[in-house]
């Protein structure tokens, strides 16, 4: 009689993660008597995947009933495949012996490759806010995909970015891979409503790429512009001075009025007006009793925005003239050294 052959018809198979893999194996003879075992890998470090008679293999089922007298089909099905299951599987026939069974013949092996989807890309921006005209870095990470080939693109408001660097790890063979990309983005004053998008395309996604986004509102700080103006007031001895705080983001803002360098009032911004570009405006006013001052008054509007060093704008109020005559003199006074230019 012809010597037993172990036939593994599939040289390779590819399975999506989470699905089942069927590994085919048949033998051509019932002799010699002895069990079939399945291994992943070859040599002394090989991993036992299935033993016909003993061992705990909850993910493995046999395709046919191995207890049937003339059974020659030793195919197995492995459930819930993960990238860690990738490798070459060997169907091995053993001959009963003493003290241990003796390996008799092995199949040629079936290489199992696992297609695994990348995780949803996670985009993260800088730890601290940055102002317009500055360049900031965004990172995008996605993990657990296989095979290694993957495409990553960056977009800002739908426009593809070109200034980025991408790495796929590890460089050599692995059960699964990770991608890491860093993109550089130049901020503009209009970016409060902008989004940065990382798009990942992979064979497992069937043309429907995964996207991760970051809102530039989390990254940008738009410093305010200040304008101090004097308004005429009907009351004989009172002048209304306003401080217009314009085009700032985020909302966190504290304003202090100083009269000749002395703190007059401090207030936190509330009831803000939102601009179309996502920035905010706010106005504060100060009612100055002119009769309480003999000399000219230097009024300063000092603004601390989002924890940054204060910026200020001053206005010189002449007390010698009649308040109503001053109404036309609305030009702001000279800016202090720390003031933001208008």
């Amino acid at each position: 009689e012809e010597e037993l052959q172990v036939i593994q018809p599939d040289k390779s198979i590819s399975v999506a993660a989470g699905e089942s893999a069927t590994l085919h194996c048949t033998v051509t003879s019932l002799i010699p008597v002895g069990p079939i075992q399945w291994f992943r890998g070859a040599g002394p470090g090989r991993e036992l995947i299935y033993n016909q008679k003993e061992g705990h293999f909850p993910r493995v089922t046999t395709v046919s009933d191995l207890t049937k007298r003339n059974n020659m089909d030793f195919s197995i099905r492995i459930s819930n495949i993960t990238p860690a299951d990738a490798g070459t599987y060997y169907c091995v026939k053993f001959r009963k012996g003493s003290p241990d069974h003796v390996e008799f013949k092995s199949g040629a092996g079936t290489e199992l490759s696992v297609r695994a989807k990348p995780s949803a890309p996670v985009v993260s921006g800088p730890a601290a806010r940055a102002t317009p005209q500055h360049t900031v870095s965004f990172t995008c990470e996605s993990h657990g995909f296989s095979p290694r080939d993957i495409t990553l693109k960056w977009f800002k408001n739908g426009n593809e970015l070109s200034d980025f660097q991408t790495n796929v790890d590890p460089a050599g063979d692995s059960v699964s891979y990770s991608i890491h990309s860093t993109a550089k983005v130049v901020l503009t004053r209009e970016d409060v409503h902008s989004q940065v998008i990382c798009e990942v395309a992979h064979v497992t996604l069937q043309g429907d790429p995964l996207r991760g986004t970051a809102n530039l509102s989390e990254t940008i700080r738009v410093p305010p512009t200040l304008e101090v103006t004097q308004q005429p007031v009907r009351a004989e001895n009172q002048v209304n001075v306003t401080c217009q705080v314009r085009k700032f983001y985020p909302q966190r803002l504290q304003l202090t009025w100083l009269e000749n360098g002395n703190v007059s009032r401090t207030e936190t911004a509330s009831t803000l007006t939102e601009n179309k570009d996502g920035t905010y405006n706010w106005m504060s006013w100060l009612l100055v009793n002119v009769s309480a001052h003999r000399d000219d008054v230097k009024l300063t509007c000092q603004v601390e925005h989002d924890g940054q060093p204060a910026v200020s704008k001053s206005h010189d109020l002449k007390v010698s003239a009649h308040p109503k005559e001053q109404g036309s003199n609305t030009a702001p006074g000279p800016a202090l050294a720390s003031a933001a230019p208008l």
Epitope: G45, E47, G55, K96, D100
Partner: antibody, heavy 114, light 108 residues
Framework: EVQLQQSGVEVVQPGASVKLSCTAS????????MHWVKQRTEQGLEWIGR????????KYAPKFQGKATMTADTSSSTAYLQLSSLTSDDTAVYYC???????WGQGTTLTVSS | QIVLTQSPAIMSASPGEKVTLTCSAS???????LYWYQQKPGSSPKLWIY???NLASGVPPRFSGSGSGTSYSLTISSMQAEDAASYFC?????????FGGGTKLEIK
């Protein structure tokens, strides 16, 4: 549901023999080896041996060679462990275990006493 | 034959404490063939960990197993009262198959 039902308590005199049984249900006994394990009171576990019910082929730990004999009857889905020339050292709980290792019988308590 | 030595033989741990039980083999055991059992008084042993690191059905995730060659371990990340039991390692890499002497784990 997989079950291994073992025979009840045995009290036997020294020098005698005893045959313990383990009846399988919920699976085909020929599909797995059947193992036997000994546990003395408050002691560890000792592997006695295993049998392939399909053809009766068996392996024994050296310590139990000549002491234990394993057999199986596939028609009744029952595995047997015969222990001979009993001494007080054989007093123990004996378990049968399916080859997949997750199913154990409830154990048979054997007491050897005069 | 392969002798499996477990240490410590007896130990006690407080709730929440990390516990590591070791199993040392007199010669190399393939990781596929190293199993752990849990046994409580009056009950049959229960398969607890198979193929060195895989938890059997129903085993809490605070348990883990690791090792290779001649050195294996079972770890409980945070000891619970219900973990008090005896634990046995077992090899079926080569005949005769053997059990370790066991570790009796008590709760403080």
């Amino acid at each position: 549901e997989v079950q291994l039902q073992q025979s009840g308590v045995e009290v036997v005199q020294p020098g005698a023999s005893v045959k313990l049984s383990c009846t399988a249900s919920g699976f085909n006994i020929e599909a797995y080896y059947m193992h036997w394990v000994k546990q003395r009171t408050e002691q560890g576990l000792e592997w006695i041996g295993r049998i392939d019910p399909e053809d009766g082929e068996s392996k024994y730990a050296p310590k139990f060679q000549g002491k234990a004999t394993m057999t199986a009857d596939t028609s009744s889905s029952t595995a047997y462990l015969q222990l001979s020339s009993l001494t007080s050292d054989d007093t123990a709980v004996y378990y049968c275990v399916r080859g997949s290792y997750e199913y154990w019988g409830q154990g048979t308590t054997l007491t050897v006493s005069s | 034959q392969i002798v499996l030595t477990q240490s410590p033989a007896i130990m006690s741990a407080s709730p929440g404490e990390k516990v590591t039980l070791t199993c040392s083999a007199s010669s190399s055991v393939s990781s596929s063939y190293l199993y752990w059992y849990q046994q409580k008084p009056g009950s049959s042993p229960k398969l607890w960990i198979y193929s060195t690191s895989n938890l059997a059905s129903g085993v809490p995730p605070r348990f883990s197993g690791s090792g290779s060659g001649t050195s294996y371990s079972l770890t409980i990340s945070s000891m619970q009262a219900e973990d008090a039991a005896s634990y046995f390692c077992y090899q079926w890499s080569s005949y005769p198959y053997t059990f370790g002497g066991g570790t009796k784990l008590e709760i403080k």
